[in-house]
Interface confidence: low
């Protein structure tokens, strides 16, 4: 449906508040280094312009595309060249190329200072003084640090952020009320950002077909009572929404997401019995709730899959007539019967089925050739099951911190060329799979664990893509989206790696470590552990454990000392010498 003025259309659909918030997010995700005030000024100018178009859609420039309008506005930033370097060259391009150019310069790891949380009273004062600016600043700070954050979902986070301050700044104990809520929002926000980053990477690197396959599998698990045609419609609409958001078309994305939520709620009888509560909520909560809704119960009378996909004489005929539709039906039927499988496993099974049909439908006796295809699935199912069992046992034995350390050692030995901060961040997140998923019963462990690992390994892939240093990482990241985890699992110690020169400075610590939070102290120790492995990749678990135990004792001792700095200097030298001796450095 063509509109005379796209900007007026979106302003009217979304309303002024959401329009302004989404434009701010879009601009902050493109120009990640610009000061807050500059972005607010740009957003206000765009909003005023949009209002003139609402009043008169045929007014000058109102017929321009959103990319043209937003791009023209971004290119008015005076400091573009000095702040962004070559990104300024985007502005010399005409619109078809310009937006593309901005997208290519999005930075997953921008050089921005860590967000430090002020004192609760300071935050509450700022909130009361100017609520609108306070909330805009939240959107801005999150969006610039997470340039692929799912914009309509960020509006939902901002709504919760506002609710937390509204409630807690009036409470008797403001800190006790507010801090847990902010911690929860921070952790959920990081998880949401990483999940969306995988969706964008899947569209960007592997194409629409890969994303649609993922969506068919996930929605079929979630809505097993829905017909295939219904699931297909939802998949098509969901793909459009995510393609738009990943491409920076945030107004269209938010608008289409609202339409999709509306459609789902109007048709919940033919989709899922679990949607009733979600559909009674306001828009932002509704969309979030639908995205997180639990799997519906499987229909009781589902027939065996073998009849249609193995025993039928028409398998090759049906496959040849419409390959992707037939494979989509296979994936739908398999996924709705297996909420206990990860989405990536279901996609591996579908790929195996596709490969078998490609080979067998060209054979002399196709049926004879593909008759045993389901037997090929057994090892594919058992591999993640065994891996999860082993790792959950290890997690239960070690606890989260030491489990993370085991993974740090494992992954540093696999890909020692990767930067230490990336190895620490990724291994810590991999280690969180234990507390996140091992508590679940068997039937929920695999979808929890393996699909979470896909999200974390994608973080490694996008960070590595910015500065590629390891052919092995590139290979695992680019060859197959669904086989990334098995690819990394299969990597052994990199025998080609030349150990890093020993540098005592890396292992020099100061009294400031004593004032760090437990989490930050862990990160310091884990950074040292990665560096140790990079110096001595053949060190045994026992050797590394001994050094890390000594290190923990050293920190504890010096943090209790009267003259902490002297203790760190003197005891630190002894620790380095002892560690060198223990590891044969």
């Amino acid at each position: 449906d063509a509109h005379k003025s796209e900007v007026a259309h979106r302003f009217k659909d979304l309303g002024e508040e959401n329009f302004k918030a989404l434009v701010l997010i879009a601009f902050a995700q493109y120009l990640q280094q610009c000061p807050f005030e500059d972005h607010v000024k740009l957003v206000n100018e765009v909003t005023e312009f949009a209002k003139t178009c609402v009043a008169d859609e045929s007014a000058e420039n109102c017929d321009k595309s959103l990319h043209t309008l937003f791009g023209d506005k971004l290119c008015t930033v005076a400091t573009l060249r000095e702040t962004y370097g070559e990104m300024a060259d985007c502005c010399a391009k005409q619109e078809p190329e310009r937006n593309e150019c901005f997208l290519q310069h999005k930075d997953d790891n921008p050089n921005l200072p860590r967000l430090v949380r002020p004192e609760v009273d300071v935050m509450c004062t700022a909130f009361h003084d100017n609520e609108e600016t306070f909330l805009k600043k939240y959107l801005y700070e999150i969006a610039r640090r997470h340039p692929y954050f799912y914009a309509p979902e960020l509006l939902f986070f901002a709504k919760r952020y506002k609710a937390a301050f509204t409630e807690c700044c009036q409470a008797a104990d403001k800190a006790a009320c507010l801090l847990p809520k902010l911690d929860e929002l921070r952790d959920e926000g990081k998880a949401s950002s990483a999940k969306q980053r995988l969706k964008c990477a899947s569209l960007q690197k592997f194409g629409e077909r890969a994303f649609k396959a993922w969506a068919v599998a996930r929605l079929s698990q979630r809505f097993p009572k829905a017909e295939f045609a219904e699931v297909s419609k939802l998949v098509t609409d969901l793909t459009k929404v995510h393609t738009e958001c990943c491409h920076g078309d945030l107004l269209e994305c938010a608008d289409d997401r609202a339409d999709l939520a509306k459609y789902i709620c109007e048709n919940q009888d033919s989709i899922s019995s679990k949607l009733k509560e979600c559909c009674e909520k306001p828009l932002l909560e509704k969309s979030h709730c639908i995205a997180e809704v639990e799997n519906d119960e499987m229909p009781a009378d589902l027939p065996s899959l073998a009849a249609d996909f193995v025993e039928s004489k028409d398998v090759c005929k049906n496959y040849a007539e419409a390959k992707d539709v037939f494979l989509g039906m296979f994936l739908y039927e398999y996924a709705r019967r297996h909420p206990d499988y990860s989405v990536v496993l279901l996609l591996r099974l579908a790929k195996t089925y596709e490969t078998t049909l490609e080979k067998c439908c060209a054979a002399a006796d196709p049926h004879e050739c593909y008759a045993k295809v389901f037997d090929e699935f057994k090892p594919l199912v058992e591999e993640p099951q065994n891996l999860i069992k082993q790792n959950c046992e290890l997690f239960e034995q070690l606890g989260e911190y030491k489990f993370q350390n085991a993974l740090l050692v494992r992954y540093t030995k696999k890909v020692p060329q990767v930067s230490t901060p990336t190895l620490v961040e990724v291994s810590r997140n991999l280690g969180k799979v234990g507390s996140k998923c091992c508590k679940h019963p068997e039937a929920k462990r695999m979808p929890c664990a393996e699909d979470y690992l896909s999200v974390v390994l994608n973080q490694l892939c996008v960070l590595h893509e910015k500065t590629p240093v390891s052919d092995r990482v590139t290979k695992c990241c680019t060859e197959s989206l669904v086989n990334r985890r098995p690819c990394f699992s299969a990597l052994e110690v990199d025998e080609t790696y030349v150990p890093k020169e020993f540098n005592a400075e890396t292992f020099t610590f100061h009294a400031d470590i004593c004032t760090l939070s437990e989490k930050e102290r862990q990160i310091k120790k884990q950074t040292a552990l990665v560096e140790l492995v990079k110096h001595k990749p053949k060190a045994t678990k026992e050797q590394l454990k001994a050094v890390m135990d000594d290190f923990a004792a050293f920190v504890e001792k010096c943090c209790k000392a009267d003259d902490k700095e002297t203790c760190f200097a003197e005891e630190g030298k002894k620790l380095v010498a002892a560690s060198q001796a223990a590891l044969g450095l």
């Epitope: 063509a2 796209e6 017929d63 595309s65 990319h67 619109e95 078809p96 190329e97 937006n99 593309e100 997208l103 569209l203 960007q204 690197k205 194409g207 629409e208 077909r209 393609t243 990943c246 491409h247």
Partner: nanobody, 116 residues
Framework: EVQLVESGGGLVQPGGSLRLSCAAS????????LAWYRQAPGKQRDLVAR???????YYADSVKGRFTISRDNSKNTLYLQMNSLRAEDTAVYYC??????????WGQGTLVTVSS
């Protein structure tokens, strides 16, 4: 990642019409904007017309009212209907695709000659 092949160019008299086609293949799912550019001998390449995925169009002033750009998404094809052709429309016409995820793509060009 997106390949483009133009066709339909040729010799035409002033006042005549031509219809150019551009067939896209490869990662066509990722295309958002399609456009026609042209380059006359010794001149730079200029935008003639473009059409967004939503169907909104833009025309250079020199072709407004004479040329019509359209796209058939089901056939992955872009068209340029050129009426009331003039000698100054003589140029190599290039098809252009702006993709969501891949570098911009250009066709190899098709020559349009307007002469009596």
């Amino acid at each position: 990642e997106v390949q483009l092949v133009e066709s339909g160019g040729g010799l035409v008299q002033p006042g005549g019409s031509l219809r150019l086609s551009c067939a896209a293949s490869g990662s066509t799912w990722s295309i958002n904007t399609l456009a026609w550019y042209r380059q006359a001998p010794g001149k730079q390449r200029d935008l003639v017309a473009r059409i967004s995925s939503g169907g909104s169009t833009y025309y250079a002033d020199s072709v407004k009212g004479r040329f019509t750009i359209s796209r058939d998404n089901s056939k992955n094809t872009l068209y340029l209907q050129m009426n009331s052709l003039r000698a100054e429309d003589t140029a190599v016409y290039y098809c252009y695709a702006q993709s969501t995820w891949y570098p911009p793509s250009w066709g190899q060009g098709t020559l349009v000659t307007v002469s009596s």
